[in-house]
Interface confidence: low
């Protein structure tokens, strides 16, 4: 901590600019008036001040705001975010999607630190849902976000969020999670027609019940291999010869190459062999 | 708990329009589909449609196209069916179900009371 | 439309009797289908949907089979309670129909 000295004289600060750059830690701590910096903080951003001086700035909003900054401050905190803690972030209140963008660009290219887990989680819980401009913001900057909730928290995204996912945004999800946005996006998608219902449709199937495949075999889909890798192996294993050939169609040449690997082995191994046989791919069960 | 809520009997004379209010709790009101069902005196139950609360999607059988109309309030979780140029025909009673999981799912899991609609000069 | 057939119409049993209902779709329902128990003024509750998966609460007595365009409901050993009107519903195609109802009556 910076310790209390007076100001010397000429040297109070009326307004936040560069000149600030040339004070000492001591300085700014003595000079720069908290009320001051609160209201100016979007000149903080375009002012190099070194990691330092940034601890001092952040001391005087500490002081200023003990429980946690207000939204006018956060939306402008730009570099001053990654001196936050997350123990700082868990007494904001966000509420605006473009303070969350703000942030997030602060942060653009690298992982996801823990300040910005906790910065979105108080956001979210703050709305009290994972809605569609959340998420939309969400995964442009974190393809893997979506995946990385548990199905709890997924539990709380509502359907109409669903049109914001893009199928690399489920690529690092589980079963379980699949198991949760399923449901959601057979309700999102439900009054489209055919094909469009499943290209959309596609990238969650890995929740999909038997029901769902059987009816999806009755519709023309020619789900590729890669597709059909992902399916919930319990789903898979009900469903008849004929119906794999209908939900694959000419994809169903592609069994052999993967008749080693789940789902393919265990679905192989419940049927009967003359009807593998009629595929004519040499499957044995 | 899950609860549908709908409103008391409606005695209306032929040719007017009648809205049913179907008031939901205890659950997500954007995550189910809200099907609705007619039942006449003595008779079984008849699907008219249903919509998507989230979307204001709808899809009706051909027999109520025209004579009903679904809609929802999302701020209040309220689901509506608005029916016109009533006739003793549409005498019966309604009601409001909330569809079982999602769409594709098979069963509807909670149903209002009903609300008996009278058709009468 | 999917037309749905129920048979029967009317049925009479004694307590502790085995019953079955059955419908019959008009095309390949893919076990999309529900079951619905009404009492006398009171609303539809659902027994069973996707064909034989009991809902919450239903008892045990209660069994849902079948396949394709046949599909029956089984009750075991009936009870008092059991006695009402029973109706089953497709989902398979856009249009979800109702078959023409089973009016259960003790013996």
């Known amino acids: 901590e910076v310790e209390k000295t007076a100001c010397p004289s000429g040297k109070k600060a009326p307004e936040i600019d560069e000149s600030l750059i040339f004070y000492k830690k001591w300085e700014l701590e003595a000079c720069v008036d908290a009320a001051l910096l609160a209201t100016q903080m979007d000149r903080v951003n375009a002012i190099p001040f070194t990691y330092e001086q940034l601890d001092v700035l952040k001391h005087k909003l500490d002081e200023l705001y003990p429980q946690g900054y207000p939204e006018s401050v956060i939306q402008h905190l730009g570099y001053l975010f990654l001196k936050m803690s997350p123990e700082d972030i868990r007494k904001w209140n966000v509420t605006s999607l473009e303070t969350l963008k703000a942030l997030l660009e602060v942060n653009k290219g690298h992982e996801m630190s823990p300040q910005v887990a906790t910065l979105i989680d108080r956001f979210v819980k703050g709305r009290g849902q994972l809605d569609k401009d959340t998420l939309d913001t969400l995964t442009a900057f974190y393809p893997g976000y979506l995946c990385s909730l548990s199905p709890e928290e997924l539990s709380s995204v509502p359907p109409s969020s669903i049109w914001a996912v893009r199928p690399q945004d489920l690529d690092t999800c589980d079963p379980r999670q699949l198991d949760v946005l399923y449901p959601k996006a057979r309700l999102a998608f439900q009054n489209m027609n055919g094909s469009e219902y499943f290209v959309k449709i596609q990238s969650f199937l890995g929740g999909a019940p038997t029901e769902d495949l059987k009816a999806l075999s009755q519709q023309n889909v020619s789900m590729d291999l890669a597709t059909f890798m992902k399916l919930r192996t319990d789903a898979v294993l009900p469903l008849t010869v004929a119906e794999v050939q209908k939900l694959l169609g000419p994809h169903v040449e592609g069994l052999k190459a993967e008749e080693r690997h789940r789902p393919v082995r265990d679905w192989i191994l419940r049927q009967r062999q003359d009807d593998l046989d009629t595929l004519g791919l040499g499957l044995q069960g | 708990e899950v609860h549908l809520q709908q409103s008391g009997p409606e005695l209306v004379k032929p040719g007017a329009s009648v809205r049913i209010p179907c008031k939901a709790s205890?659950?997500?009101?954007?995550?189910?589909?809200m099907d609705w069902v007619k039942q006449s005196h003595g008779k079984s139950l008849e699907w008219i449609g249903d919509i998507n609360p989230d979307n204001g999607g709808t899809i009706y059988t051909q027999k109520f196209k025209g004579k009903a109309t679904l809609t929802v309030d999302k701020s209040s979780s309220t689901a509506y069916m608005e029916l016109r140029s009533l006739t003793s025909e549409d005498t019966a009673v309604y009601y409001c179900a909330r569809r079982l999981h999602y769409y594709g799912s098979s069963g509807l899991d909670y149903w209002g009371q009903g609300t008996t609609l009278t058709v009468s000069s | 439309d999917i037309q749905m057939t129920q048979s029967p119409a009317s049925l009479s049993a004694y307590v502790g009797e085995t019953v079955t209902i059955t419908c019959r779709a008009s095309?390949?329902?893919?076990?999309?289908l529900a079951w619905y128990q009404q009492k006398q003024g009171k609303s539809p509750q659902l027994l069973v949907y996707?064909?034989?998966t009991l809902a919450d609460g239903v008892p045990s007595r209660f069994s849902g089979s079948g396949s394709g365009t046949q599909y029956s409901l089984k009750i075991n050993s009936l009870q008092p309670e059991d006695f009402g009107s029973y109706y089953c519903?497709?989902?398979?195609?856009?249009?979800?129909?109702f078959g023409g109802g089973t009016k259960l009556e003790i013996k």
């Open positions: 519903q497709h989902f398979w195609s856009t249009v979800w129909t």
């Open positions: 095309g390949n329902i893919h076990n999309y």
């Open positions: 996707n064909a034989k």
């Open positions: 205890g659950y997500t009101f954007t995550d189910y589909n």
